[in-house]
Amino acid sequence: ILGGREAEAHARPYMASVQVNGEHLCGGVLVAEQWVLSAAHCLEDAADGKVQVLLGAHSLSQPEPSKRLYDVLRAVPHPDSRPDTIDHDLLLLQLSEKATLGPAVRPLPWQRVDRDVEPGTLCDVAGWGIVSHAGRRPDRLQHVLLPVLDRATCNRRTHHDGAITQRMMCAESNRRDSCKGDSGGPLVCGGVLEGVVTSGSRVCGNRKKPGIYTRVASYAAWIDSVLA
């Protein structure tokens, strides 16, 4: 998260860290007791490593009573996701067991109504991704409030040049932005999960390259079918 600040500890009990060999790789969001939603591209970086999900965390390194690392029983990338595009960049991870819920671990309601979020709406994005152009990675969860950007502006030739489909949404990226390591994390508007940070190689913090988020409402049928 660029230009953000440390989040209030455990105030986002849905927040997950998707880890490979014990190292944070991507964000994720608990959407059901045994399921975490993330970005499909995150699996590419996992290679043959052991994928696990950390729930109930604020600090990645410090012991916390609510922290627990879960093994992954099943990883389900969206069937249409591809390595060379950010289309359908969603991944569902089934935990080895149901998460132990409490004040610091709780699923987040996700948007089922397939309607665009009003441009200008302030949405919260959080993660353990890099916090500066230097690439420094934080130990504690960071967050930032970003205004939603209308698709027409996001698709301008000077911006993303038509790459933003109806199944994606954009948020402003002027110094405040999601970045490397935040992929798969939640974009939350009005207490509801609206988007998942895509995991392309986009430059961060540049207002002409807005943040791209996969709209979960556009994938409600797929999510329901996997969770069923």
């Epitope: 190292e23 970086d45 890099i130 152009h133 230097a134 690439g135 490397k180 190689s201």
Partner: antibody
């Protein structure tokens, strides 16, 4: 423990090229940025450029564009700095740095005929 | 390009003395980093994001500032603090270093 191990000192002739390596341990280079910084004898630090090893994206100080090429091999957790058309002005110590936080020990490059 | 000017270029301080050095930018910057380089060693990150202490750095070091003016303070000078200190900005590309302040022990 995070460590960056750089290749040994180089003595090269003017006009030649050299490739310096930086092998990381204790972390996966794909998860951060690797920077290269130079320091000429008795001078200050100069940022050369950086690479995002996950996708190969690079960014350079315009002053070093064409002179320096940064690459990475994620399979060996190693970053490289190639310097071309060397002159005496390129005589310096070159450091690789993880996120500007963890520094390698530096590689001394001397350009002399 | 953001030019960072550090002052003084050279200074000396006695053990226990408070030390302050400055870094001035020719245009407004943010995300200032400070590094320490002892003779014959690689630089070491001291301060990131203007005022945050890097891991393992003694609490006698502190950073502050905004806009075009930043400073690094050592509350009580110790012999091991004799080194050259560099500032670096991370808000305007290309990301530039200052010329350094050499701190000697009296």
């Amino acid at each position: 423990e995070v460590q960056l191990q750089q290749s040994g000192a180089e003595l090269v002739k003017p006009g030649a090229s050299v490739r310096l390596s930086c092998t990381a341990s204790g972390f996966n280079i794909k998860h951060t940025y690797i920077h290269w910084v130079s320091q000429r004898p008795e001078q200050g630090l100069e940022w050369i450029g950086k690479i995002d090893p996950a996708n190969g994206n690079t960014k350079y100080d315009p002053k070093f564009q064409g002179k320096a090429t940064i690459t990475a091999d994620t399979s060996s957790n190693t970053a490289y700095l190639q310097l071309s058309s060397l002159t005496s002005e390129d005589t310096a110590v070159y450091y690789c740095v993880n996120a500007m936080e963890y520094w390698g020990q530096g590689t001394s490059v001397t350009v002399s005929s | 390009q953001s030019v960072l000017t550090q002052s003084p270029a050279i200074m000396s301080a006695s053990p226990g003395e408070k030390v302050t050095m400055t870094c001035s930018a020719n245009s407004s910057v943010s995300d200032m980093y400070w590094f320490q380089q002892r003779p014959g060693s690689s630089p070491r990150l001291l301060i990131y994001d203007t005022s945050n202490l890097a891991s393992g750095v003694p609490v006698r070091f502190s950073g502050s500032g905004s806009g075009t003016s930043y400073s690094l303070t050592i509350s009580r000078m110790e012999a091991e603090d004799a080194a050259t200190y560099y500032c670096q900005q991370w808000s305007t590309y290309p990301w530039t270093f200052g010329g350094g302040t050499k701190l000697e022990i009296k």
